[in-house]
């Protein structure tokens, strides 16, 4: 199964095939499955693509979709690190305006303590 290990797609794989790429990853890497039409190929990544976070699991780590509302990138299942355009980041969540007592930092789109 590791006979395609010289192929760049097989980098970091524990199991790899010419047709489907990686199906299992080395311990510290994250599995990500690229789907194209009815085909798919796996990759083993050091960090997950935008919109996904690294989920650690007993059998294999994987990238999982960030499902926090109005969030573009997240650190974990419930902690956002970057909000979609037009939304402000506050304590891992995204708001259309900063909560009372917090002011928006336009450069980073984060809510910081202080008066508006």
């Amino acid at each position: 199964r590791a006979s395609y290990v010289s192929n760049p797609i097989c980098k970091g794989c524990l199991s790899c095939s010419k047709d489907n790429g990686c199906s299992r990853c080395q311990q510290k890497l994250f599995f990500f499955l690229r789907r194209e039409g009815m085909r798919q190929y796996g990759e083993c990544l050091h960090s997950c693509p935008s919109g996904y976070y690294g989920h650690r699991a007993p059998d294999m780590n994987r990238c999982a979709r960030c499902r926090i509302e109005n969030c573009d990138s997240c650190f974990s299942k419930d902690f956002c690190t970057k909000c979609k355009v037009g939304f402000y980041l506050h304590r891992g969540r995204c708001f259309d305006e900063c909560p009372d007592g917090f002011a928006p930092l336009e450069e980073t789109m984060e809510c910081v303590e202080g008066c508006e």
Partner: antibody, heavy 125, light 107 residues
Framework: EVQLVESGGGLVKPGGSLRLSCAAS????????MSWVRQAPGKGLEWVSS???????YYPDSVKGRFTISRDNAKNSLYLQMNSLRAEDTAVYYC???????????????????WGQGTTVTVSS | DIQMTQSPSSLSASVGDRVTITCKAS??????VAWYQQKPGKAPKLLIY???TRHTGVPSRFSGSGSGTDFTLTISSLQPEDFATYYC?????????FGQGTKVEIK
């Protein structure tokens, strides 16, 4: 609470048509892929069709060209148009959330996480 | 198509027993396997996805493991409400395919 309610099943002759509906509530319907899965009497589960949140459709060879999956996000509804029905299409048809073959999620939506109670389709002369 | 073969097809067990159901894929499916529970006349319910992640509200007595081609569903201490049929499903590549089911009956 996620709820899926199927309707439209019934008795139809071989070669006939039927349209199944699934009314969804308790979640943002337009954001999720949806699927149909069937179960013939006394048998196991068989995937019938999936539709992505963006409207891309997927079918196994057994129903391709005969069945059409569609959705109406404004009505929070999923449909399955079944044409040229055969005796082997007799089954309970379940509507389920998730199961998009075109997108990797790495979470519950890759499986089918909520199912309706099913609607029975009988194809017999 | 990827075939999913479950064993055993049925088993008899008592309340409190540890029950193990296995599922073998005909080719490597990474960790993309889900497990469902179905009671007579009812819809299936998702228990486990991505081989080992429990779905919301699923009791901790249910656990899944495996990767590649060999997968296991374990019920650590069988409860009266666990008597049902269990199905595995691969969500790696289409067509999505299910195992034939394992019926867990009361001894």
């Amino acid at each position: 609470e996620v709820q899926l309610v199927e309707s439209g099943g019934g008795l139809v002759k071989p070669g006939g048509s039927l349209r199944l509906s699934c009314a969804a509530s308790g979640f943002t319907f337009s954001s999720y892929a949806m699927s149909w899965v069937r179960q013939a009497p006394g048998k196991g589960l068989e995937w019938v069709s999936s539709i992505s949140s963006g409207g891309s459709t997927y079918y196994p060879d057994s129903v391709k060209g005969r069945f059409t999956i569609s959705r109406d996000n404004a009505k929070n509804s999923l449909y399955l148009q079944m044409n040229s029905l055969r005796a082997e299409d007799t089954a309970v048809y379940y509507c389920a959330r998730g199961g998009d073959p075109g997108v990797y999620n790495g979470d519950y939506e890759d499986a089918m996480d909520y199912w309706g109670q099913g609607t029975t389709v009988t194809v017999s002369s | 198509d990827i075939q999913m073969t479950q064993s055993p097809s049925s088993l008899s067990a008592s309340v409190g027993d540890r029950v193990t159901i296995t599922c073998k894929a005909s080719q490597d499916v990474s960790s993309a396997v889900a497990w469902y529970q179905q009671k007579p006349g009812k819809a299936p319910k998702l228990l486990i996805y991505w081989a080992s992640t429990r779905h919301t509200g699923v009791p901790s007595r249910f656990s899944g493991s495996g990767s590649g081609t060999d997968f296991t569903l374990t019920i650590s201490s069988l409860q009266p409400e666990d008597f049902a049929t269990y199905y595995c499903q691969q969500h790696y590549s289409t067509p999505w395919t299910f195992g034939q089911g394992t019926k867990v009956e009361i001894k």
